[in-house]
């Protein structure tokens, strides 16, 4: 691998204080091209034996200050008929991303790394049946 | 060259229903939100909503909440606003806006669609 | 919700001169404004986003100041093309609102 030097101008990476200084581009690329993200599908909140609805979560002080959160419709799945199978359950599929969260009175602005759990979605799972003793 | 164009103007009876649509190009149509938003004659301009085509995730303005509906059609790159019940006071120019949701603002507007709302 | 109150309603300038622009929110709202130009007829568009940053394309006289509660639009040259109302905007939380507009009218 090729060494690049480091310029003067740059932050010396082995500082202590490196970490406090970085900046950060918040420009957001698409790298998979925009044939792929078109392809994105949106209705299978809808079509799902366990469908959700989406909310937009803001946070003025966060980065992305907009994430769109899945929200299980009903606590059981729903059957070929159209009706709730009392056998399933809807349970919400969470991911862990990481945020910005920027520091309160902080000027100018400086943000520190959070992880948040992120709801993306509904699948439908067999109820635990307990048996009697 | 990103384009944002609306349907012409409406003319509707109170209680009746209209459908506003708005054809985006030049870019990638489930990648941002759409917002819409009102402009009454000589008046300021009020959110109604927002809808994100990649997703189909929808948000309301309270007051636009029962009367209000977005909608996204992907494959011919069109967002809806139907708006239902209609009384005088909703006549106003209705325009569509795309929001970038990381950047955080409106860049490209719609034309308008002029909405009366007569008996 | 959010209220943007502009001043003034109406503002009388010369061309050439400077003109500002006032836009007050009803609480903090960080630097979460955009500031806008309408022509009659026309759709609103985009000039300062993030309270001072120019948006591409728009004439470097147009500048934004401004955060927490209290934000200014200052037009330092006045062209022609530049009588129009002008619309401060708040993303910062949803309903996102605007300012009823100050109208720039030749003097």
């Known amino acids: 691998a090729a060494i690049i030097p480091q310029s003067s101008a740059c932050p010396n990476t082995e500082a202590k204080d490196f970490l406090q200084n970085v900046k950060v581009n918040l420009k957001v690329f698409n790298s998979l091209g925009a044939k792929v993200s078109s392809r994105r599908p949106s209705d299978y909140l809808n079509r799902s034996t366990s469908p959700w609805t989406l909310h937009r979560n803001e946070d003025p002080d966060r980065y992305p200050s907009v994430i769109w959160e899945a929200q299980c419709r009903h606590q059981r799945c729903v059957n070929a008929e159209g009706k709730l199978d009392h056998h399933m359950n809807s349970v919400l599929i969470q991911q862990e991303i990481l945020v910005l969260k920027r520091e309160p009175e902080s000027c100018p602005f400086t943000f520190r790394v959070e992880k948040m759990l992120v709801g993306v979605g509904c699948t439908c799972v067999a109820s635990i049946v307990r048996q009697a003793a | 060259e990103v384009q944002l164009v609306q349907s012409g103007a409406e003319v509707k009876k109170p209680g009746a229903s209209v459908k506003v649509s708005c054809k985006a190009s030049g870019y990638t149509f489930t990648d941002y939100e759409f917002h819409w938003v009102r402009q009454a004659p000589g008046q300021g301009l009020e959110w109604i909503g927002v809808?994100?085509?990649?997703?189909?995730?929808?948000a309301y303005n309270q007051n636009f909440r029962d009367r209000a509906t977005l909608t996204a059609d992907k494959s011919t790159s069109t967002a809806y606003m139907e708006l239902s019940s209609l009384r005088s006071e909703d006549t106003a120019v209705y325009y569509c806006t795309r929001f970038l949701t990381y950047e955080g603002y409106f860049d490209y507007w719609g034309q308008g669609t002029l909405v009366t709302v007569s008996s | 919700e959010i209220v943007m109150t502009q001043s003034p309603a109406t503002l009388s300038v010369s061309p050439g001169e400077r003109a500002t622009l006032s836009c007050k929110a009803s609480q903090s709202v960080s630097i979460d404004v955009g500031w806008f130009q309408q022509k009659p007829g026309q759709s609103p568009r985009l000039l300062i986003y993030?309270?001072?940053n120019r948006y591409t394309g728009v004439p470097a006289r147009f500048s934004g100041s401004g955060s927490g509660t209290d934000f200014t639009l200052t037009i330092s040259s006045l062209q022609p093309e530049d009588f129009a109302v002008y619309f401060c905007?708040?993303?910062?939380?949803?309903?996102?609102?605007f300012g009823q507009g100050t109208k720039l009218e030749i003097k």
């Open positions: 993030h309270a001072s």
């Open positions: 809808i994100h085509p990649g997703n189909g995730g929808t």
């Open positions: 905007q708040q993303d910062y939380s949803s309903p996102y609102t």
